[in-house]
């Protein structure tokens, strides 16, 4: 999708639905692209992103990507279509209301990614193991 500072022409008349056939509406996500971050060794972090946007496409969800290498830590916040890979990974948890970070294998860095389907859910990124799929809040499927 497009970052907040880039404009684009959008004319698409499809009705987008989720897996259950319900009409999918766009949602509000933090959208700062890549920023340096101080989030490290914490159970959860706030994004510290001051830019909120309505995703351009109804099917898009909120995504956060946390990366750490020898030099710095960055946090990326965007809207993205879960049907398409992001950073070569599938967004498995796109229906979750919370952004639960999962580690992905990337050479030369520590790489965590999460996606979620409630407004501004990528503002609070969760690393803690206590939030797992047995948490009833994660079983809540949200279409906003």
């Amino acid at each position: 999708t497009i970052p907040p500072h880039v404009q684009k022409s959008v004319n698409n008349d499809m009705i987008v639905t989720d897996n259950n056939g319900a009409v999918k509406f766009p949602q509000l996500c933090k959208f700062c692209d890549v920023r340096f971050s101080t989030c490290d060794n914490q159970k959860s972090c706030m994004s510290n992103c001051s830019i909120t946007s309505i995703c351009e496409k109804p099917q898009e969800v909120c995504v956060a990507v946390w990366r750490k290498n020898d030099e710095n830590i960055t946090l990326e916040t965007v809207c993205h279509d879960p049907k398409l890979p992001y950073h070569d990974f599938i967004l498995e948890d796109a229906a979750s209301p919370k952004c639960i970070m999962k580690e992905k294998k990337k050479p030369g860095e520590t790489f965590f990614m999460c996606s979620c389907s409630s407004d501004e859910c990528n503002d609070n990124i969760i690393f803690s193991e206590e939030y797992n799929t047995s948490n009833p809040d994660l079983l809540l499927v949200i279409f906003q």
Epitope: I2, P3, P4, H5, V6, Q7, V10, N11, N12, D13, V16, F25, P26, Q27, L28, F31, S50, I51, T52, S53, I54, C55, E56, K57, P58, P97, S118, D119, E120, D123, N124, L140, V141, I142, F143, Q144
Partner: antibody, heavy 116, light 110 residues
Amino acid sequence: EVQLLESGGGLVQPGGSLRLSCAASGFTFSSYSMSWVRQAPGKGLEWVSWISYNDRSVYYADSVKGRFTISRDNSKNTLYLQMNSLRAEDTAVYYCARRIAAFDYWGQGTLVTVSS
Amino acid sequence: QSVLTQPPSASGTPGQRVTISCTGSSSNIGSNAVSWYQQLPGTAPKLLIYANSHRPSGVPDRFSGSKSGTSASLAISGLRSEDEADYYCGTWDSSLSGYVFGGGTKLTVL
């Protein structure tokens, strides 16, 4: 069927307070963010406030910041708007609406009149 | 003064096509999806278009929306007397951190 029913409007003096409620039914209230939008008599729509599904995130229009407080009780399927230090320019029909990216359902509105 | 600019009025005859414009800036329409709302006299607003060009179920395909750059527009084809209403565009403003509406356009069917 999705229904939003506002209540709590009425006549109040400048400087006074009111608490509006919005009772939701027909959908899983705790899964949706909610908003308040108002419309002064004969004027256009003005967004007032928004609250996330789990009330972690709230936003307010500059015109009400510091005076109005949005809250929700998911166990009661109810949205609230606490309005303090009311001014004449707050006179309007107040609507609660579902979501923020697109207000897909609206209540019928409750009239708030601020006058001495 | 509204953040989004709409013409205060528009008119057309039955069967005609009418377009209502909505102009904003890079912090609102330029970077956020736009919605359109219809408000019939004495009633609450109703969602007409979301995500720039998508229609909720139940909205006739005579209504269509589009967006380009920092402007959006609502087109109504095959105008009918029941389309006489106020129309509002709306979107998030990433600079103001709030939702913004246009001033509204009163559509008259002559």
